[in-house]
Interface confidence: low
Amino acid sequence: EAHKSEIAHRYNDLGEQHFKGLVLIAFSQYLQKCSYDEHAKLVQEVTDFAKTCVADESAANCDKSLHTLFGDKLCAIPNLRENYGELADCCTKQEPERNECFLQHKDDNPSLPPFERPEAEAMCTSFKENPTTFMGHYLHEVARRHPYFYAPELLYYAEQYNEILTQCCAEADKESCLTPKLDGVKEKALVSSVRQRMKCSSMQKFGERAFKAWAVARLSQTFPNADFAEITKLATDLTKVNKECCHGDLLECADDRAELAKYMCENQATISSKLQTCCDKPLLKKAHCLSEVEHDTMPADLPAIAADFVEDQEVCKNYAEAKDVFLGTFLYEYSRRHPDYSVSLLLRLAKKYEATLEKCCAEANPPACYGTVLAEFQPLVEEPKNLVKTNCDLYEKLGEYGFQNAILVRYTQKAPQVSTPTLVEAARNLGRVGTKCCTLPEDQRLPCVEDYLSAILNRVCLLHEKTPVSEHVTKCCSGSLVERRPCFSALTVDETYVPKEFKAETFTFHSDICTLPEKEKQIKKQTALAELVKHKPKATAEQLKTVMDDFAQFLDTCCKAADKDTCFSTEGPNLVTRCKDALA
């Protein structure tokens, strides 16, 4: 229904706390360099204005669209051009072009320092002094670093953060209470960020149809007892929610997500038997829980898929008369039978099925042509299964750090032109798949591994798009989203690459490395490893292992030495010489 004042409508629906949080996220995601105080001031002004519209929907400007209201606020910021350069040109445009312009200027890799967590006492003090401001800072800092973070989900993580602080700040040993809990939230939030970015990429590059196909597959796996109409309705609603969030319409997105959660909880009987525990929770927890709910038990009496999609005499007629619905039904039926497949694999199978029908339905004897289509799926299924087995075996043998290093070597060989920080970040993220997925029960490994890898590779593509340097990466990133992972997996050593010359300073280290946290130490070592591979792309695993073991031994020795500086300055050059010799 149309509302006289959109801003009043959203304020009433969401309530002041969520309204303010979402407006803060929106501003922080658009203008990523502004300070918290600048954004907080704008949020307060917008909130005060919303309240006047709630009191009187006919008041001046209350009938304006949210994009107009928010855009006008952003464009009124002083020194916009000095701080944001050509983003200021967006302000010369009218809606909806102005908002599109803001979206295009979102930076996936803003040059902001890492979000450092203060020590426990300081955190608890500022949290107790002003919990609202503290959580505002959290929303601001996360949103500006992750400009596509799913806004209602970020409110959920802020709520988790709040609960953890409330509990831990009351304890004697705050540090040991806070650290593991906040680390857990951080890990989940980072995964949530890359997953949502993938959804927005799908929406931006391939449109709503592509996203809806993803949603149908995912929902069919989770709710195999829901009928196709129910799945389609949920997929349509979910597509709308994600389109709004990816498009910066965060108030609408959060409101519609709450509506979707309400609908699901009111219609459990036709959706899934597993929703009740989620539905008993308050709003943010409920929506989060529904998004991660376990798969319902598959119906026992499902007929073979071939009956409707291969053996039926009307296959080509069905396909010709309702392509999208027929393919959607195929995707639904196949997905609900295979919770053990990744969504990416299911979409590849649906694409193969579509291509087969396109070809066969134009032939003289279609059934003879498409009769073998399900058998032709076999290599498509085997490929990711082998990938999971190979990589999980390697992870189990090497552990997370060693597995990351193996991936780093592999990807540096595939795309040596890519910057070392990007390669290290990608390899570290890709390597976490082991810890995240390889320990799961067998039937959950493939979906976990492949869908996670796809999301990480999407980030690689986004960063590479900014400064394209590798033809290999460009080739894999240009294709369809679901083909990316197999494309990257199939890449081999880039034969066109001219090895980097050996620079001693790249492998020169100082005593300050000794005091770094373990994670930072690992990054330093992995940076050196990537540089070694760039110097010798065809170095054997044995050669690289020798050098890295020597390097680890060198660090261990010098970090234990009484005079660390002298040890680093004398032993360092010897290490460099040994490295060169080992790789010669």
Epitope: G184, T277, E292
Partner: nanobody
Framework: EVQLLESGGGLVQPGGSLRLSCAAS????????VAWFRQAPGKEREFVAG????????YYADSVKGRFTISRDNSKNTLYLQMNSLRPEDTAVYYC???????????????????WGQGTLVTVSS
Amino acid sequence: EVQLLESGGGLVQPGGSLRLSCAASGRYIDETAVAWFRQAPGKEREFVAGIGGGVDITYYADSVKGRFTISRDNSKNTLYLQMNSLRPEDTAVYYCAARPGSPLITSKVADLYPYWGQGTLVTVSS
């Protein structure tokens, strides 16, 4: 540090039921992956059932599916294993295990669980 204490074991006739409990301290049980394992005399320790943290995703060994139910009571910080239709081959020492590093991940591999209870003996015999 997580401490786990199992209880509820005992002697039961075939076809009977038992409910095992595992009280946790040092960590909220809904934030960690927890599982039940069992070890029969002279055999390897085997996975029985598991439940993920944060989201109540449950896992079962094929041999107990439909007979055993894993659950937890967050307010009591306790994990349960309801065992129905017990068979003589269910005789074993039952252990509760926790894996706080991966709150959502339940694994069937015993080595991946750093925290264990001392076990409770279940004997199914007529």
